[in-house]
Protein backbone atom coordinates (compact mmCIF):
# COMPACT_ATOMS: atom_id res chain seq x y z
CA UNK A 1 0.00 0.00 0.00
CA UNK A 2 2.69 2.14 0.72
CA UNK A 3 5.02 0.69 -2.21
CA UNK A 4 8.67 -0.99 -1.37
CA UNK A 5 8.51 -4.98 -0.74
CA UNK A 6 5.03 -6.94 0.05
CA UNK A 7 4.21 -10.44 1.30
CA UNK A 8 1.87 -12.37 -0.59
CA UNK A 9 1.54 -15.21 1.60
CA UNK A 10 -1.62 -16.58 3.00
CA UNK A 11 -1.34 -17.33 6.86
CA UNK A 12 -2.71 -16.19 9.81
CA UNK A 13 -0.29 -13.38 11.82
CA UNK A 14 -0.79 -12.64 15.25
CA UNK A 15 1.18 -9.67 16.37
CA UNK A 16 1.71 -9.83 20.24
CA UNK A 17 2.33 -6.68 21.73
CA UNK A 18 4.07 -5.86 25.47
CA UNK A 19 2.06 -3.22 26.53
CA UNK A 20 3.68 -3.26 30.42
CA UNK A 21 4.38 0.39 32.10
CA UNK A 22 7.84 0.40 31.17
CA UNK A 23 6.22 0.67 27.29
CA UNK A 24 4.49 3.94 28.44
CA UNK A 25 6.20 7.18 26.62
CA UNK A 26 7.31 4.27 23.57
CA UNK A 27 3.43 3.09 22.34
CA UNK A 28 3.61 5.37 19.35
CA UNK A 29 6.54 3.87 18.04
CA UNK A 30 5.25 0.30 18.64
CA UNK A 31 1.87 1.28 16.88
CA UNK A 32 3.31 2.93 13.43
CA UNK A 33 5.89 -0.41 13.71
CA UNK A 34 2.57 -2.51 13.43
CA UNK A 35 0.91 -0.34 11.23
CA UNK A 36 3.48 0.03 8.56
CA UNK A 37 3.92 -3.77 8.65
CA UNK A 38 0.46 -4.63 8.75
CA UNK A 39 -0.04 -2.87 5.27
CA UNK A 40 2.88 -5.58 3.93
CA UNK A 41 1.05 -8.42 4.09
CA UNK A 42 -1.42 -8.09 1.06
CA UNK A 43 -2.70 -11.40 0.34
CA UNK A 44 -6.61 -11.69 0.78
CA UNK A 45 -5.91 -15.07 2.12
CA UNK A 46 -4.23 -13.48 5.40
CA UNK A 47 -5.92 -12.81 8.22
CA UNK A 48 -4.63 -10.65 11.40
CA UNK A 49 -4.90 -10.39 14.72
CA UNK A 50 -3.69 -8.11 17.40
CA UNK A 51 -2.87 -8.89 21.02
CA UNK A 52 -1.45 -7.03 24.00
CA UNK A 53 0.05 -7.94 27.17
CA UNK A 54 1.17 -6.56 30.56
CA UNK A 55 -0.56 -7.85 33.80
CA UNK A 56 -3.12 -9.99 31.65
CA UNK A 57 -3.29 -10.33 27.50
CA UNK A 58 -5.82 -8.90 25.72
CA UNK A 59 -7.28 -10.06 22.42
CA UNK A 60 -7.92 -6.33 20.71
CA UNK A 61 -8.46 -7.78 17.42
CA UNK A 62 -9.38 -11.46 16.80
CA UNK A 63 -8.32 -12.90 13.76
CA UNK A 64 -9.67 -11.59 10.33
CA UNK A 65 -8.80 -11.02 6.96
CA UNK A 66 -11.30 -7.95 6.61
CA UNK A 67 -9.58 -4.80 5.44
CA UNK A 68 -11.77 -2.85 7.23
CA UNK A 69 -11.91 -4.64 10.55
CA UNK A 70 -7.83 -5.01 10.12
CA UNK A 71 -8.12 -0.91 10.02
CA UNK A 72 -10.50 -0.21 12.99
CA UNK A 73 -8.32 -2.63 14.79
CA UNK A 74 -5.04 -0.16 13.94
CA UNK A 75 -7.17 2.83 15.66
CA UNK A 76 -8.06 0.50 18.67
CA UNK A 77 -4.50 0.03 19.25
CA UNK A 78 -3.47 3.29 18.63
CA UNK A 79 -5.69 4.46 21.56
CA UNK A 80 -4.08 1.42 23.77
CA UNK A 81 -2.46 2.86 27.32
CA UNK A 82 0.84 0.71 28.68
CA UNK A 83 0.56 0.24 32.17
CA UNK A 84 1.07 -3.40 34.40
CA UNK A 85 3.43 -5.85 34.52
CA UNK A 86 4.98 -7.95 31.69
CA UNK A 87 3.06 -10.93 31.53
CA UNK A 88 4.34 -12.45 28.11
CA UNK A 89 2.70 -15.80 28.49
CA UNK A 90 -0.34 -14.32 28.66
CA UNK A 91 -0.29 -12.85 25.15
CA UNK A 92 1.12 -15.95 23.96
CA UNK A 93 -1.83 -17.63 25.17
CA UNK A 94 -4.30 -15.64 23.90
CA UNK A 95 -3.09 -16.31 20.38
CA UNK A 96 -2.64 -19.89 20.73
CA UNK A 97 -6.44 -19.83 21.76
CA UNK A 98 -7.59 -19.03 18.51
CA UNK A 99 -5.18 -21.39 16.95
CA UNK A 100 -6.70 -24.07 18.90
CA UNK A 101 -10.20 -22.64 17.85
CA UNK A 102 -9.42 -22.12 14.30
CA UNK A 103 -7.45 -25.98 14.10
CA UNK A 104 -11.12 -27.49 15.19
CA UNK A 105 -12.36 -26.25 11.87
CA UNK A 106 -10.25 -29.00 9.65
CA UNK A 107 -8.37 -27.01 6.99
CA UNK A 108 -5.29 -25.79 9.35
CA UNK A 109 -3.73 -22.67 8.50
CA UNK A 110 -0.64 -21.51 9.15
CA UNK A 111 0.36 -19.20 11.72
CA UNK A 112 2.83 -16.99 12.34
CA UNK A 113 3.06 -15.23 15.28
CA UNK A 114 5.56 -11.68 16.29
CA UNK A 115 6.02 -10.93 19.73
CA UNK A 116 7.37 -7.76 20.82
CA UNK A 117 8.85 -6.93 24.60
CA UNK A 118 11.35 -4.22 26.16
CA UNK A 119 12.36 -6.27 28.96
CA UNK A 120 14.24 -9.04 30.64
CA UNK A 121 11.55 -11.37 31.92
CA UNK A 122 12.52 -12.51 35.53
CA UNK A 123 13.11 -15.88 36.13
CA UNK A 124 8.96 -17.11 36.76
CA UNK A 125 7.59 -14.76 33.70
CA UNK A 126 10.37 -16.16 31.23
CA UNK A 127 9.88 -19.82 32.14
CA UNK A 128 6.12 -19.26 31.82
CA UNK A 129 6.43 -17.40 28.05
CA UNK A 130 8.87 -20.24 26.96
CA UNK A 131 6.36 -23.04 27.81
CA UNK A 132 3.20 -20.97 26.17
CA UNK A 133 5.58 -20.28 23.37
CA UNK A 134 6.11 -23.89 23.33
CA UNK A 135 2.35 -24.38 23.27
CA UNK A 136 1.94 -22.45 20.02
CA UNK A 137 4.32 -24.01 18.32
CA UNK A 138 3.06 -27.56 19.19
CA UNK A 139 -0.19 -25.70 17.49
CA UNK A 140 2.00 -25.47 14.22
CA UNK A 141 3.03 -21.67 14.82
CA UNK A 142 6.28 -20.26 13.48
CA UNK A 143 7.38 -18.12 16.30
CA UNK A 144 9.19 -14.46 15.82
CA UNK A 145 10.23 -12.41 18.77
CA UNK A 146 11.09 -8.57 18.81
CA UNK A 147 13.66 -7.40 21.01
CA UNK A 148 13.62 -3.60 22.43
CA UNK A 149 15.89 -1.76 24.07
CA UNK A 150 16.34 -3.74 28.14
CA UNK A 151 15.99 -7.28 26.18
CA UNK A 152 17.99 -10.44 27.01
CA UNK A 153 18.43 -11.96 23.62
CA UNK A 154 19.30 -15.57 25.11
CA UNK A 155 15.82 -14.90 26.86
CA UNK A 156 13.93 -14.49 22.85
CA UNK A 157 15.95 -16.78 21.44
CA UNK A 158 14.46 -19.62 23.43
CA UNK A 159 10.69 -17.76 23.34
CA UNK A 160 11.51 -17.85 19.53
CA UNK A 161 11.97 -20.66 16.90
CA UNK A 162 15.77 -20.28 17.35
CA UNK A 163 18.30 -17.06 17.02
CA UNK A 164 17.71 -16.88 14.09
CA UNK A 165 13.73 -15.78 14.52
CA UNK A 166 15.28 -12.75 16.58
CA UNK A 167 15.01 -9.20 16.48
CA UNK A 168 17.02 -7.10 18.24
CA UNK A 169 16.66 -3.36 18.22
CA UNK A 170 19.64 -2.18 20.31
CA UNK A 171 19.07 1.31 19.50
CA UNK A 172 15.66 2.05 21.30
CA UNK A 173 12.12 2.67 20.25
CA UNK A 174 12.86 5.13 17.34
CA UNK A 175 14.80 2.28 15.38
CA UNK A 176 11.80 -0.30 15.44
CA UNK A 177 11.29 1.11 11.64
CA UNK A 178 14.71 0.38 10.76
CA UNK A 179 13.92 -3.82 10.75
CA UNK A 180 10.60 -3.68 8.82
CA UNK A 181 12.31 -5.05 5.58
CA UNK A 182 14.01 -7.60 7.73
CA UNK A 183 10.97 -8.96 9.44
CA UNK A 184 9.40 -8.79 6.86
CA UNK A 185 11.81 -10.51 4.24
CA UNK A 186 12.41 -13.23 7.12
CA UNK A 187 8.91 -13.71 8.26
CA UNK A 188 7.09 -13.80 5.19
CA UNK A 189 6.47 -17.47 3.28
CA UNK A 190 4.60 -16.80 -0.21
CA UNK A 191 3.89 -18.66 -2.78
CA UNK A 192 4.19 -16.55 -5.61
CA UNK A 193 4.02 -19.35 -8.66
CA UNK A 194 4.59 -23.12 -10.29
CA UNK A 195 6.04 -23.94 -13.25
CA UNK A 196 4.75 -25.31 -15.12
CA UNK A 197 1.28 -24.20 -14.20
CA UNK A 198 -0.27 -26.32 -16.78
CA UNK A 199 0.12 -30.14 -16.93
CA UNK A 200 -0.39 -33.39 -18.95
CA UNK A 201 -3.59 -35.13 -17.46
CA UNK A 202 -2.72 -39.20 -16.35
CA UNK A 203 1.33 -37.78 -16.39
CA UNK A 204 3.79 -37.36 -13.43
CA UNK A 205 5.59 -34.54 -13.81
CA UNK A 206 7.85 -32.25 -11.64
CA UNK A 207 6.51 -28.78 -10.37
CA UNK A 208 9.40 -25.59 -9.57
CA UNK A 209 6.71 -24.00 -6.99
CA UNK A 210 8.27 -20.50 -6.81
CA UNK A 211 7.89 -18.17 -3.79
CA UNK A 212 9.96 -16.78 -0.73
CA UNK A 213 10.86 -17.84 3.03
CA UNK A 214 10.65 -21.81 2.43
CA UNK A 215 13.55 -22.06 4.47
CA UNK A 216 12.20 -20.66 7.58
CA UNK A 217 11.06 -24.13 8.76
CA UNK A 218 12.31 -24.83 12.18
CA UNK A 219 13.07 -27.85 10.34
CA UNK A 220 14.03 -27.68 6.69
CA UNK A 221 12.82 -32.19 6.24
CA UNK A 222 9.31 -31.33 7.78
CA UNK A 223 8.58 -28.86 4.16
CA UNK A 224 5.59 -30.21 2.03
CA UNK A 225 3.76 -29.22 -0.69
CA UNK A 226 0.49 -29.71 -0.89
CA UNK A 227 -2.29 -29.87 -3.46
CA UNK A 228 -5.74 -29.37 -2.71
CA UNK A 229 -7.12 -31.17 -5.63
CA UNK A 230 -10.95 -29.54 -6.84
CA UNK A 231 -11.31 -27.72 -3.21
CA UNK A 232 -11.69 -31.23 -1.75
CA UNK A 233 -8.80 -33.53 -1.39
CA UNK A 234 -5.17 -32.98 -0.20
CA UNK A 235 -2.28 -34.62 -1.47
CA UNK A 236 1.34 -33.83 0.05
CA UNK A 237 4.45 -34.17 -0.96
CA UNK A 238 7.74 -34.41 0.05
CA UNK A 239 9.63 -31.59 -2.19
CA UNK A 240 13.01 -33.02 -3.72
CA UNK A 241 14.92 -30.21 -2.84
CA UNK A 242 14.06 -26.64 -0.74
CA UNK A 243 15.69 -23.53 -1.40
CA UNK A 244 14.63 -20.01 0.18
CA UNK A 245 12.83 -18.98 -2.91
CA UNK A 246 12.01 -22.46 -5.02
CA UNK A 247 10.66 -25.76 -3.70
CA UNK A 248 11.20 -28.83 -6.13
CA UNK A 249 8.14 -31.34 -6.10
CA UNK A 250 6.83 -34.52 -7.37
CA UNK A 251 3.12 -33.48 -8.78
CA UNK A 252 0.36 -35.45 -8.14
CA UNK A 253 -0.96 -37.57 -11.22
CA UNK A 254 -4.17 -35.71 -12.30
CA UNK A 255 -5.90 -38.36 -14.19
CA UNK A 256 -9.29 -36.07 -16.15
CA UNK A 257 -8.79 -32.57 -18.15
CA UNK A 258 -9.29 -29.87 -16.42
CA UNK A 259 -9.01 -30.67 -13.09
CA UNK A 260 -7.57 -28.04 -10.66
CA UNK A 261 -5.00 -28.08 -7.85
CA UNK A 262 -4.43 -25.17 -5.40
CA UNK A 263 -0.72 -25.43 -4.34
CA UNK A 264 0.20 -24.98 -0.57
CA UNK A 265 3.27 -25.36 1.57
CA UNK A 266 3.76 -26.84 5.02
CA UNK A 267 6.56 -25.84 7.08
CA UNK A 268 5.89 -28.81 9.88
CA UNK A 269 4.72 -31.91 8.28
CA UNK A 270 1.09 -31.05 7.09
CA UNK A 271 0.19 -29.45 10.29
CA UNK A 272 -0.76 -26.34 9.22
CA UNK A 273 -0.51 -24.96 5.67
CA UNK A 274 0.18 -21.83 3.82
CA UNK A 275 -2.27 -20.97 1.00
CA UNK A 276 -1.89 -19.10 -2.65
CA UNK A 277 -3.62 -17.93 -5.39
CA UNK A 278 -1.78 -20.21 -7.56
CA UNK A 279 -3.17 -23.03 -9.49
CA UNK A 280 -2.11 -25.55 -11.58
CA UNK A 281 -4.39 -27.20 -14.21
CA UNK A 282 -4.74 -30.66 -16.11
CA UNK A 283 -5.06 -30.34 -20.09
CA UNK A 284 -5.09 -33.29 -22.99
CA UNK A 285 -1.75 -33.77 -24.07
CA UNK A 286 -1.17 -35.69 -27.58
CA UNK A 287 1.55 -38.11 -27.92
CA UNK A 288 5.21 -36.36 -28.50
CA UNK A 289 3.43 -32.83 -27.18
CA UNK B 1 -17.10 -43.19 19.83
CA UNK B 2 -15.42 -40.23 22.25
CA UNK B 3 -16.77 -40.83 25.70
CA UNK B 4 -15.78 -40.14 29.36
CA UNK B 5 -17.40 -41.65 32.66
CA UNK B 6 -17.23 -40.77 35.60
CA UNK B 7 -17.60 -42.59 38.84
CA UNK B 8 -16.82 -41.92 42.64
CA UNK B 9 -19.71 -40.04 43.88
CA UNK B 10 -21.71 -40.08 46.83
CA UNK B 11 -22.62 -39.17 50.19
CA UNK B 12 -20.25 -37.88 52.29
CA UNK B 13 -19.76 -35.77 55.86
CA UNK B 14 -18.89 -32.25 56.03
CA UNK B 15 -14.78 -32.28 56.51
CA UNK B 16 -14.56 -35.64 54.88
CA UNK B 17 -12.82 -36.76 51.47
CA UNK B 18 -13.83 -38.49 48.31
CA UNK B 19 -12.11 -39.46 45.26
CA UNK B 20 -13.49 -39.12 41.65
CA UNK B 21 -12.67 -40.90 38.13
CA UNK B 22 -13.18 -40.00 34.72
CA UNK B 23 -12.28 -43.27 32.24
CA UNK B 24 -12.02 -41.77 28.61
CA UNK B 25 -11.87 -43.88 25.22
CA UNK B 26 -12.18 -42.96 21.27
CA UNK B 27 -9.62 -40.32 21.16
CA UNK B 28 -5.82 -39.60 22.38
CA UNK B 29 -6.13 -39.10 25.80
CA UNK B 30 -2.78 -37.80 26.20
CA UNK B 31 -3.29 -35.02 23.22
CA UNK B 32 -5.76 -33.00 25.59
CA UNK B 33 -6.09 -31.18 28.49
CA UNK B 34 -9.30 -32.02 31.00
CA UNK B 35 -11.24 -30.40 32.82
CA UNK B 36 -13.72 -31.04 36.10
CA UNK B 37 -17.10 -29.16 35.79
CA UNK B 38 -20.03 -28.48 38.00
CA UNK B 39 -23.30 -27.98 38.75
CA UNK B 40 -25.54 -27.83 41.65
CA UNK B 41 -28.66 -28.73 42.27
CA UNK B 42 -31.09 -26.46 40.21
CA UNK B 43 -28.00 -24.10 39.71
CA UNK B 44 -25.96 -23.13 36.90
CA UNK B 45 -22.02 -24.54 35.73
CA UNK B 46 -19.23 -23.62 37.55
CA UNK B 47 -15.44 -24.50 36.43
CA UNK B 48 -13.27 -26.20 39.26
CA UNK B 49 -10.38 -27.28 37.70
CA UNK B 50 -8.17 -27.98 34.83
CA UNK B 51 -5.15 -30.41 34.27
CA UNK B 52 -2.60 -29.99 31.00
CA UNK B 53 -2.38 -33.11 28.25
CA UNK B 54 1.10 -34.38 30.30
CA UNK B 55 -0.43 -33.19 33.92
CA UNK B 56 2.28 -30.69 34.19
CA UNK B 57 0.33 -28.04 35.10
CA UNK B 58 -2.61 -27.62 37.25
CA UNK B 59 -5.12 -24.73 37.34
CA UNK B 60 -7.90 -24.36 40.28
CA UNK B 61 -11.31 -22.23 40.77
CA UNK B 62 -10.58 -19.92 44.10
CA UNK B 63 -13.41 -21.99 45.62
CA UNK B 64 -11.42 -25.40 45.36
CA UNK B 65 -7.72 -24.25 46.16
CA UNK B 66 -5.80 -25.48 48.35
CA UNK B 67 -9.09 -28.62 49.05
CA UNK B 68 -8.86 -30.45 45.60
CA UNK B 69 -6.41 -31.73 43.66
CA UNK B 70 -6.65 -32.53 39.70
CA UNK B 71 -4.55 -35.44 38.46
CA UNK B 72 -4.47 -38.06 35.49
CA UNK B 73 -2.95 -41.41 34.67
CA UNK B 74 -2.29 -40.97 31.11
CA UNK B 75 -1.16 -45.06 31.16
CA UNK B 76 -4.69 -45.58 32.27
CA UNK B 77 -6.61 -42.93 29.92
CA UNK B 78 -8.11 -41.50 33.60
CA UNK B 79 -9.00 -38.23 35.23
CA UNK B 80 -9.32 -37.48 38.90
CA UNK B 81 -10.51 -35.44 41.20
CA UNK B 82 -9.64 -35.51 44.71
CA UNK B 83 -11.35 -33.38 47.05
CA UNK B 84 -10.46 -32.87 50.13
CA UNK B 85 -11.85 -31.12 53.52
CA UNK B 86 -15.41 -30.87 51.66
CA UNK B 87 -17.97 -28.12 52.13
CA UNK B 88 -22.48 -28.14 51.98
CA UNK B 89 -21.66 -26.15 49.22
CA UNK B 90 -19.29 -28.59 47.36
CA UNK B 91 -22.97 -30.61 46.65
CA UNK B 92 -23.31 -31.11 43.01
CA UNK B 93 -22.98 -33.07 39.72
CA UNK B 94 -19.59 -33.12 39.03
CA UNK B 95 -18.86 -33.44 34.95
CA UNK B 96 -15.38 -34.33 33.47
CA UNK B 97 -15.16 -32.76 30.34
CA UNK B 98 -12.11 -32.97 27.67
CA UNK B 99 -10.81 -29.26 27.20
CA UNK B 100 -8.94 -26.70 25.21
CA UNK B 101 -8.96 -23.17 26.06
CA UNK B 102 -12.06 -23.07 27.76
CA UNK B 103 -13.36 -24.92 25.49
CA UNK B 104 -15.56 -28.22 26.56
CA UNK B 105 -16.23 -30.07 23.45
CA UNK B 106 -16.80 -33.55 25.61
CA UNK B 107 -18.55 -34.00 28.49
CA UNK B 108 -19.64 -37.40 30.68
CA UNK B 109 -22.68 -37.79 32.26
CA UNK B 110 -21.44 -36.61 35.37
CA UNK B 111 -21.41 -37.94 39.23
CA UNK B 112 -23.16 -36.77 42.25
CA UNK B 113 -21.17 -35.92 45.44
CA UNK B 114 -23.80 -34.62 48.13
CA UNK B 115 -21.95 -33.73 51.32
CA UNK B 116 -24.42 -33.55 54.23
CA UNK B 117 -24.30 -34.49 58.03
CA UNK C 1 -12.05 -10.75 35.59
CA UNK C 2 -14.49 -10.90 33.05
CA UNK C 3 -18.35 -11.91 34.66
CA UNK C 4 -20.89 -12.84 31.89
CA UNK C 5 -24.87 -11.81 32.25
CA UNK C 6 -27.61 -13.92 30.96
CA UNK C 7 -31.26 -13.34 30.99
CA UNK C 8 -32.86 -16.15 33.76
CA UNK C 9 -35.49 -17.09 30.72
CA UNK C 10 -36.39 -16.50 27.22
CA UNK C 11 -40.17 -17.67 25.38
CA UNK C 12 -40.37 -18.37 21.93
CA UNK C 13 -43.21 -19.80 19.39
CA UNK C 14 -41.95 -22.12 17.67
CA UNK C 15 -40.72 -22.05 13.91
CA UNK C 16 -39.75 -18.38 15.08
CA UNK C 17 -36.18 -16.98 16.13
CA UNK C 18 -34.66 -17.28 18.92
CA UNK C 19 -32.08 -14.85 20.86
CA UNK C 20 -30.86 -15.45 24.53
CA UNK C 21 -28.23 -13.01 24.82
CA UNK C 22 -24.41 -13.01 26.92
CA UNK C 23 -23.10 -9.71 28.16
CA UNK C 24 -20.03 -8.91 29.85
CA UNK C 25 -17.77 -6.03 30.23
CA UNK C 26 -16.14 -5.85 26.48
CA UNK C 27 -16.94 -9.10 25.79
CA UNK C 28 -15.92 -8.54 22.34
CA UNK C 29 -12.41 -9.04 23.21
CA UNK C 30 -13.14 -12.63 24.24
CA UNK C 31 -14.16 -15.58 22.52
CA UNK C 32 -17.85 -16.80 23.64
CA UNK C 33 -18.87 -20.55 23.85
CA UNK C 34 -22.16 -21.66 23.89
CA UNK C 35 -23.98 -25.24 25.78
CA UNK C 36 -27.25 -26.24 25.54
CA UNK C 37 -28.60 -28.85 28.30
CA UNK C 38 -31.62 -30.63 28.95
CA UNK C 39 -33.06 -31.86 31.80
CA UNK C 40 -31.11 -35.07 33.58
CA UNK C 41 -28.42 -34.69 30.74
CA UNK C 42 -24.82 -33.60 30.49
CA UNK C 43 -24.10 -30.12 28.67
CA UNK C 44 -23.46 -30.51 24.93
CA UNK C 45 -21.50 -27.35 22.83
CA UNK C 46 -23.23 -25.74 20.10
CA UNK C 47 -21.05 -23.08 19.24
CA UNK C 48 -17.76 -21.85 20.09
CA UNK C 49 -15.30 -18.97 19.25
CA UNK C 50 -18.05 -16.63 19.14
CA UNK C 51 -19.98 -18.21 15.80
CA UNK C 52 -18.25 -22.00 14.82
CA UNK C 53 -20.48 -24.89 14.94
CA UNK C 54 -19.33 -28.20 15.78
CA UNK C 55 -20.32 -30.69 13.61
CA UNK C 56 -23.37 -32.76 14.30
CA UNK C 57 -25.26 -29.40 15.57
CA UNK C 58 -27.82 -28.35 13.46
CA UNK C 59 -27.64 -25.36 10.93
CA UNK C 60 -30.05 -23.11 12.71
CA UNK C 61 -27.44 -22.73 15.75
CA UNK C 62 -25.42 -19.19 15.39
CA UNK C 63 -23.46 -17.01 17.10
CA UNK C 64 -22.24 -13.33 17.08
CA UNK C 65 -20.37 -11.56 19.71
CA UNK C 66 -20.43 -7.43 19.23
CA UNK C 67 -19.54 -4.95 21.81
CA UNK C 68 -20.10 -5.87 25.48
CA UNK C 69 -22.48 -8.52 24.09
CA UNK C 70 -22.56 -12.09 22.44
CA UNK C 71 -25.83 -13.43 21.03
CA UNK C 72 -26.72 -17.28 20.10
CA UNK C 73 -29.77 -16.95 17.63
CA UNK C 74 -31.65 -20.33 16.95
CA UNK C 75 -33.64 -19.64 13.89
CA UNK C 76 -36.67 -21.80 13.08
CA UNK C 77 -36.92 -22.95 16.48
CA UNK C 78 -37.85 -26.32 17.25
CA UNK C 79 -39.47 -28.02 20.29
CA UNK C 80 -36.42 -29.98 20.90
CA UNK C 81 -34.70 -26.70 21.16
CA UNK C 82 -36.19 -26.45 24.62
CA UNK C 83 -33.26 -26.30 27.18
CA UNK C 84 -31.09 -24.47 29.37
CA UNK C 85 -28.24 -22.45 27.87
CA UNK C 86 -24.99 -21.32 29.21
CA UNK C 87 -22.85 -18.79 27.43
CA UNK C 88 -18.94 -19.12 29.19
CA UNK C 89 -15.61 -17.38 27.71
CA UNK C 90 -12.10 -18.47 29.02
CA UNK C 91 -10.27 -15.27 30.81
CA UNK C 92 -6.57 -17.61 30.89
CA UNK C 93 -5.20 -19.99 32.62
CA UNK C 94 -4.99 -18.32 35.74
CA UNK C 95 -8.86 -17.64 36.26
CA UNK C 96 -9.73 -20.67 34.19
CA UNK C 97 -13.56 -20.94 32.38
CA UNK C 98 -16.46 -17.82 33.58
CA UNK C 99 -20.04 -19.48 32.56
CA UNK C 100 -23.09 -16.97 32.32
CA UNK C 101 -26.22 -18.16 34.99
CA UNK C 102 -27.53 -20.10 31.99
CA UNK C 103 -30.98 -19.29 29.89
CA UNK C 104 -34.22 -21.72 30.09
CA UNK C 105 -35.24 -21.59 26.51
CA UNK C 106 -38.93 -21.87 26.41
CA UNK C 107 -40.41 -23.46 23.11
CA UNK C 108 -44.35 -21.97 23.65
Known amino acids: EDGGPACYGGFDLYFILDKSGSVLHHWNEIYYFVEQLAHKFISPQLRMSFIVFSTRGTTLMKLTEDREQIRQGLEELQKVLPGGDTYMHEGFERASEQIYYENRQGYRTASVIIALTDGELHEDLFFYSEREANRSRDLGAIVYCVGVKDFNETQLARIADSKDHVFPVNDGFQALQGIIHSILKKSCIEILAAEPSTICAGESFQVVVRGNGFRHARNVDRVLCSFKINDSVTLNEKPFSVEDTYLLCPAPILKEVGMKAALQVSMNDGLSFISSSVIITTTHCSDGS | QVQLVESGGGLVQPGGSLRLSCAAS????????LSWVRQAPGKGLEWVSN????????YYADSVKGRFTISRDNSKNTLYLQMNSLRAEDTAVYYC??????????WGQGTLVTVSS | DIELTQPPSVSVAPGQTARISCSGD??????VHWYQQKPGQAPVLVIY???KRPSGIPERFSGSNSGNTATLTISGTQAEDEADYYC???????????FGGGTKLTVL
Open chain 2, 97 to 106: ARAGYGLFDV
Open chain 2, 26 to 33: GFTFNSYG
Open chain 2, 51 to 58: ISSNGSYT
Open chain 3, 26 to 31: KLREYY
Open chain 3, 49 to 51: GDN
Open chain 3, 88 to 98: SSWAGSRSGTV
